[in-house]
C-alpha cells in the first residue's frame, strides 16, 4: 500500500523517525511512515528528487535550496508558542545614542548569534548584498564581511580565514576560554549574547531575534549584565533607513523569517502529508503521550525531525517555496547563497568594436593581476542586438547596454540587470528627466491632455527626450493612434506642425518640418544638426521661445540651461526660467523646478545585462572591487575602467561619464531598471513596429 | 536614375474595369511612397492618394476614396491603380510619382491616357 | 481641404523677361508649399519644395519665396525651355493640392 519515507539527517534522528514510525502504526495511522537514512539535509533533499525518500522537514535557507534547486515544495508548516504564528523576525538592533542606519553600516563594530545561524547572519548579510550594501567578490562572503564591518563577533566563525576581523569584539567565558566558540562557552553566543555584545558596548549593532530586546532588558533577564538594561534606550533599524522603537518590529525588520516546514516533491500529494501528521500530532503531542513528535529531550538532542518549540503543524495552502519563505526572506536569501564551486571561472564580456576589444583585453588583463574573479574574457558580437542574442545563447554572459536596448534585452531575450552605472549628479546628459515646457500663459493654458492641434517642438527625429519618449507617451495614453503602424503621419496629424529635424529623410512628413526656420540664409530647413536652428535641446527651446511652437519636448535642465543669463545668446539673454512651466502626465502645469515630479519619463543610466540565471551579485561585486582599483580616472594602477581615450573611442564597454558601478537593489528586473514611465513610453513606441 | 514607367494608353467602355500599371526602377522600391494623379483634359492636377509599398498601407484623397483602389506588388516593384466599373468622367491622364526626401510627389512617370467612351 | 489659388492663369513674356506667379493658400501652410513645371505631353517636374528649396538640379534662375499664405514662384530670366505651366501645390497637409495653373506663353 502507500508508504511515506522520512529522511532522517542523524542517527539520532534516525532513532527518533523509528520511534514515531511505530507510534504512528501502533495507532493505525495510514499511511505508513517508514525511515531513511541521509547523512545530511542536502543530501536528504537530493534522495527526495530522486524518488528514494519522500519528506523532511528544513529551515527556510534549505527550503529555498529545495524549492530552487531540485523543484521541491513545502506542504506542512510548524507553529511555535509565540504571537506570530508561522515565523519570527529578523532584526537590527542599535543603542539609541548612535547614529547608525542601515545605510550607514560599513565600518560599525557587529554582533552575530552565530555564523550561518538564521538571523544573526543569514538575513541579515543575505540583506546587505541583495541590497546592494554589501559587495561579494568570488563568492567570498567571510571576506566581504570581514571588509565590511570594522570588527565583529561571529560565533564559530575561528575557523575561518578571516577570524581575526569576525572575532575581534568576542570574550569568551568569564576565564576568557572559548573565544567565538559557537556555543555558550562564548559570552556573545546566540541570541542573548549578541545583544550583550552591543549592550555592553562591544558592538555597535546586534542582529537576533524581534523579541530578544524585550526578553533581555526591563528586568526580565537573570544574568548580571542585563539587570539595568532598558529597552527604550534600543531601537530597530529599518530597510528604509529609518529608525524605530524596539516593539515595532512588525514593521521595522530586516526580514520575516518562515518556520521551519516538510518539503516534498512537486507531484506529491501535500493534503496526504497533513493528515498523516495531523493524525500524529493529535495523538503524540501532548505531555504523557507514549511518543513525544515535538521533543528530542530522549534521544539527547534537540531539534530533531521537527523544532521542539512547535506548538502544532499547520497545512500550507500556497505550496511554492517563494509563498512560503515570503520576498524579504527570499531576497535575503538569494544575497547570501553563492556557492564558490559553481561559480563560473570566467565572465565572458560582449564587445562591439575593435577599440571595445582592445580596452576588454586591458581589464582582462589588470583584473587578472589583481586576481579579481571571475576572471574576464572578450566575446565580439556584430550589434547590440546580436550581444542579446549571444548572451541568450550562453556562449557570452555580460553587456553594458543603454535604455532603449535594456528594454529590448529584457523584453525580447530575457535578460536581467546585474549592475548599473552612476554619473555625477551634476551630469545631466547621461541620466535625466523628459520634460513638456510651455510658456507661462494664463490666458491660452492648456494641458498635457490638450496637445491635439498644438505646435510642438522637438529636439529631433529619434532623440530620446525630443522624440522617442513624449511620441511613445502620447501613444501610449491613446492620445495619437497609429493607422497600419505610420506613428510620423500620426504625429504629423495629431500636431498642427512642429519641427522635428531629422538626418536622410524619406517620405518624411512636412508637417513635422513647417515649424523649423533652417540656417539664418533659410537654408537646410528641418536638417538634423546645429545648422538647422531649431534642432536639439536648446533648439528646441528656442523653437518655443520664438513663439513657433507652444511646446517643447526637452531634457529637464534645458530651460536652466538657456534662461537667467546662462546663455548669452542674443535669443536667450533675457529669459527668466520663471516664464515657462511644466505639463505634467496628471494634467497639471508645474514650475519648472519641479521636474522630478512632473516628468513623462526619467532616461535610465546604461545598465549591465545578464542572462537570469547568473549571479548578479559576483558581477557587481566583481565590478565593485575593480572599480576600487580602477574607477577613478586618475589612478595609477594601470587601467582606467570608466575612460575610453587611450582606445581612440568613446563610452567604451562603460560610458566615459560614469563615476561608480552600482548595485541594482530592488530593480532586478528590465522594468524596475528603466522605470514605468519610461517603458510605457517605449512600448507606446515598439507597439507600432510591424 | 529614378525612374517610372507606366503602362500604355487604354480605352474603355463605361462599366468596365481597369488595373494601369507603374513600375519603379532605379531605386530601392519599397523606401518610398507611390503617388497617382489625376489631370482631366486640360485641367489641373489633382492628388488621388498614396501607397507605402513597404506595408501596403493606403492614403486616399476624399473625393477618390470609393472610386478607386491603390495597391502594390514588392516583388515586381510594381503599382497599381485600378478601377471596377470606369465612368466617361474618369478620362484623363494619370500620373503615378514616387515620393522624395517628404511625403509628396518628386519624381513622376510619364503617364498613361485613360479614355472612356462608349 | 486646403485650397491653393494661383495667378494669372496665363501670361505672356519674351526671353530675358523677369516673371512672376504668385499662390495663395486658403488657411496657413507655414513655408509647405512646391512648385512644379509642366511642358505639353509631359509629366511634371519638382522645381521648389519648402517655398523656397530648389530641387536638385534645377536651375538658380528659378526661386521662391513667402510663408504662411501668400508665396511667389520668380523665374530671374526666361528662358526658351522655360514656356511651360507652373503649378503651386501645398505639402503640409494631405490631401496635397494644386493651384489651377499658370500658363507662361511666349510674347
Known amino acids: 500500500g502507500m508508504e511515506v519515507r522520512w529522511c532522517a539527517t542523524s542517527d539520532p534522528e534516525q532513532h527518533k523517525c523509528g520511534n514515531m514510525s511505530e507510534a504512528f502504526r501502533e495507532a493505525g495511522i495510514q499511511p505508513s511512515l517508514l525511515c531513511v537514512r541521509g547523512t545530511s539535509a542536502d543530501h536528504c533533499v537530493q534522495l527526495i528528487a530522486a524518488q528514494e525518500a519522500d519528506a523532511i522537514t528544513l529551515d527556510g535557507g534549505a527550503i529555498y535550496e529545495a524549492g530552487k534547486e531540485h523543484g521541491l515544495k513545502p506542504v506542512v508548516g510548524e507553529v511555535y508558542d509565540q504571537e506570530v504564528g508561522t515565523s519570527y523576525y529578523a532584526v537590527a538592533v542599535v543603542r539609541r545614542s548612535s547614529h547608525v542606519t542601515i545605510d550607514t553600516l560599513k565600518g560599525v563594530k557587529s554582533c552575530h548569534t552565530g555564523i550561518n545561524r538564521t538571523v544573526g547572519w543569514n538575513v541579515p548579510v543575505g540583506y546587505l548584498v541583495e541590497s546592494g550594501r554589501l559587495s561579494v567578490m568570488g563568492c567570498d562572503v567571510l571576506k566581504a564581511v570581514s571588509d565590511y564591518f570594522g570588527g565583529s563577533c561571529v560565533p564559530g566563525a575561528g575557523e575561518t580565514s578571516y577570524s581575526e576581523s569576525l572575532c575581534r569584539l568576542c570574550r569568551g567565558d568569564s576565564s576568557g576560554e572559548g573565544v567565538c566558540d559557537k556555543s555558550p562557552l562564548e559570552r556573545y553566543y546566540d541570541y542573548s549574547g549578541a545583544f550583550r555584545c552591543l549592550a555592553e558596548g562591544a558592538g555597535d549593532v546586534a542582529f537576533v531575534k524581534h523579541s530578544t530586546v524585550l526578553e533581555n532588558t526591563d528586568g526580565k533577564t537573570l544574568p548580571s549584565w542585563g539587570q539595568a538594561l532598558l529597552s527604550q534606550d534600543f531601537e530597530l533599524l529599518c530597510r528604509d533607513g529609518s529608525r524605530a522603537d524596539v516593539t515595532e518590529w512588525r514593521q521595522c525588520h530586516l526580514a520575516r523569517v518562515p518556520a521551519h516546514a516538510v518539503v516534498v516533491r512537486a507531484d506529491t500529494d501535500g493534503g496526504l502529508i497533513f493528515r498523516l501528521l495531523n493524525e500524529g500530532q493529535r495523538l503524540f503531542s501532548h505531555e504523557g503521550s507514549s511518543f513525544q513528535m515535538f521533543s528530542s529531550e530522549a534521544y539527547g538532542q534537540k531539534d530533531l525531525l521537527f523544532k521542539d518549540s512547535t506548538s502544532e503543524l499547520v497545512p500550507i495552502a500556497t505550496q511554492t517555496y517563494e509563498a512560503w519563505l515570503g520576498h524579504e526572506y527570499l531576497h535575503a536569501m538569494k544575497g547570501l547563497l553563492c556557492d564558490p564551486n559553481r561559480l563560473p571561472p570566467y565572465l565572458r564580456w560582449c564587445v562591439l568594436s575593435t577599440p571595445e576589444i582592445q580596452k576588454c583585453g586591458d581589464m582582462a588583463v589588470a583584473f587578472r593581476r589583481q586576481r579579481l574573479k571571475p576572471e574576464i574574457q572578450c566575446v565580439s558580437a556584430k550589434s547590440p542586438q546580436h550581444c542579446m542574442e549571444r548572451i541568450q545563447a550562453e556562449q557570452v554572459d555580460a553587456v553594458t547596454l543603454s535604455g532603449e536596448d535594456i528594454y529590448t534585452a529584457g523584453k525580447t531575450y530575457g535578460l536581467v540587470p546585474a549592475a548599473g552605472e552612476h554619473y555625477a549628479p551634476e551630469d545631466s546628459s547621461n541620466s535625466y528627466y523628459v520634460v513638456a515646457v510651455v510658456r507661462r500663459d494664463s490666458s491660452h493654458a492648456f494641458t498635457l491632455d490638450e496637445l491635439r492641434g498644438k505646435r510642438s517642438c522637438h529636439a529631433g527625429f529619434g532623440s530620446p527626450a525630443g522624440w522617442d519618449v513624449p511620441v511613445g507617451a502620447l501613444i501610449q495614453r491613446g492620445f495619437i493612434r497609429p493607422k497600419d503602424c505610420d506613428v510620423l503621419t500620426a504625429v504629423s496629424e495629431f500636431f498642427n506642425a512642429s519641427c522635428v529635424p531629422v538626418n536622410n529623410p524619406k517620405n518624411y512628413p512636412s508637417s513635422l518640418c513647417a515649424l523649423c526656420v533652417g540656417d539664418e540664409q533659410g537654408r537646410n530647413k528641418c536638417v538634423g544638426n546645429s545648422q538647422e536652428r531649431y534642432y536639439g535641446y536648446r533648439g528646441a527651446f528656442r523653437c518655443l521661445v520664438e513663439n513657433a511652437g507652444d511646446v517643447a519636448f526637452v531634457r529637464h535642465t534645458t530651460v536652466f540651461d538657456n534662461t537667467n543669463g546662462h546663455n548669452s545668446e542674443p535669443w536667450a539673454a533675457e529669459l527668466r526660467s520663471e516664464d515657462y512651466e511644466l505639463l505634467c502626465p496628471n494634467g497639471a502645469r508645474a514650475e519648472v523646478s519641479q521636474f522630478a515630479a512632473c516628468n513623462l519619463a526619467q532616461i535610465p543610466p546604461h545598465a549591465v545585462m545578464v542572462r537570469p540565471d547568473t549571479n548578479i551579485f559576483t558581477v557587481y561585486g566583481l565590478l565593485d572591487k575593480a572599480q576600487d582599483l580602477f574607477g577613478d580616472d586618475h589612478n595609477k594602477n594601470g587601467f582606467k575602467m570608466f575612460d575610453s581615450s587611450n582606445y581612440h573611442g568613446q563610452d567604451l564597454l562603460f560610458k566615459d561619464a560614469t563615476v561608480r558601478a552600482v548595485p541594482v537593489g530592488e530593480k532586478t528586473t528590465y522594468r524596475g531598471w528603466l522605470g514605468l514611465d519610461y517603458v510605457a513610453a517605449l512600448e507606446g513606441m515598439s507597439s507600432q513596429q510591424c | 536614375e529614378v525612374q517610372l514607367v507606366q503602362s500604355g494608353a487604354e480605352v474603355k467602355k463605361p462599366g468596365e474595369s481597369l488595373k494601369i500599371s507603374c513600375k519603379g526602377s532605379g531605386y530601392s522600391f519599397t523606401d518610398y511612397y507611390l503617388h497617382w494623379v489625376r489631370q482631366m483634359p486640360g485641367k489641373g492636377l489633382e492628388w488621388m492618394g498614396r501607397?507605402?509599398?513597404?506595408?501596403?498601407?493606403?492614403s486616399y484623397n476624399q473625393i477618390f476614396k470609393d472610386q478607386v483602389t491603390i495597391s502594390a506588388d514588392k516583388s515586381i516593384s510594381t503599382a497599381y491603380l485600378q478601377w471596377s466599373s470606369l465612368k466617361a468622367s474618369d478620362t484623363a491622364m494619370y500620373y503615378c510619382?514616387?515620393?522624395?526626401?517628404?511625403?509628396?510627389?518628386?519624381?513622376w512617370g510619364q503617364g498613361t491616357t485613360v479614355t472612356v467612351s462608349s | 481641404d486646403i485650397q491653393m489659388t494661383q495667378s494669372p492663369s496665363s501670361l505672356s513674356a519674351s526671353v530675358g523677361d523677369r516673371v512672376t506667379i504668385t499662390c495663395k493658400a486658403s488657411q496657413d501652410v507655414y513655408a509647405a508649399v512646391a512648385w512644379y513645371q509642366q511642358k505639353p505631353g509631359k509629366a511634371p517636374k519638382l522645381l521648389i519644395y519648402?517655398?523656397?528649396t530648389r530641387h536638385a538640379g534645377v536651375p538658380s534662375r528659378f526661386s521662391g519665396s513667402g510663408s504662411g499664405t501668400d508665396f511667389t514662384l520668380t523665374i530671374s530670366s526666361l528662358q526658351p525651355e522655360d514656356f511651360a505651366t507652373y503649378y503651386c501645390?501645398?505639402?503640409?497637409?494631405?490631401?496635397?493640392?494644386f493651384g489651377q495653373g499658370t500658363k507662361v506663353e511666349i510674347k
Open positions: 519648402w517655398a523656397s
Open positions: 510619382a514616387r515620393g522624395g526626401d517628404y511625403d509628396f510627389p518628386w519624381y
Open positions: 501645390q501645398q505639402h503640409y497637409r494631405t490631401p496635397w493640392t
Open positions: 501607397i507605402n509599398p513597404y506595408n501596403g498601407a493606403t
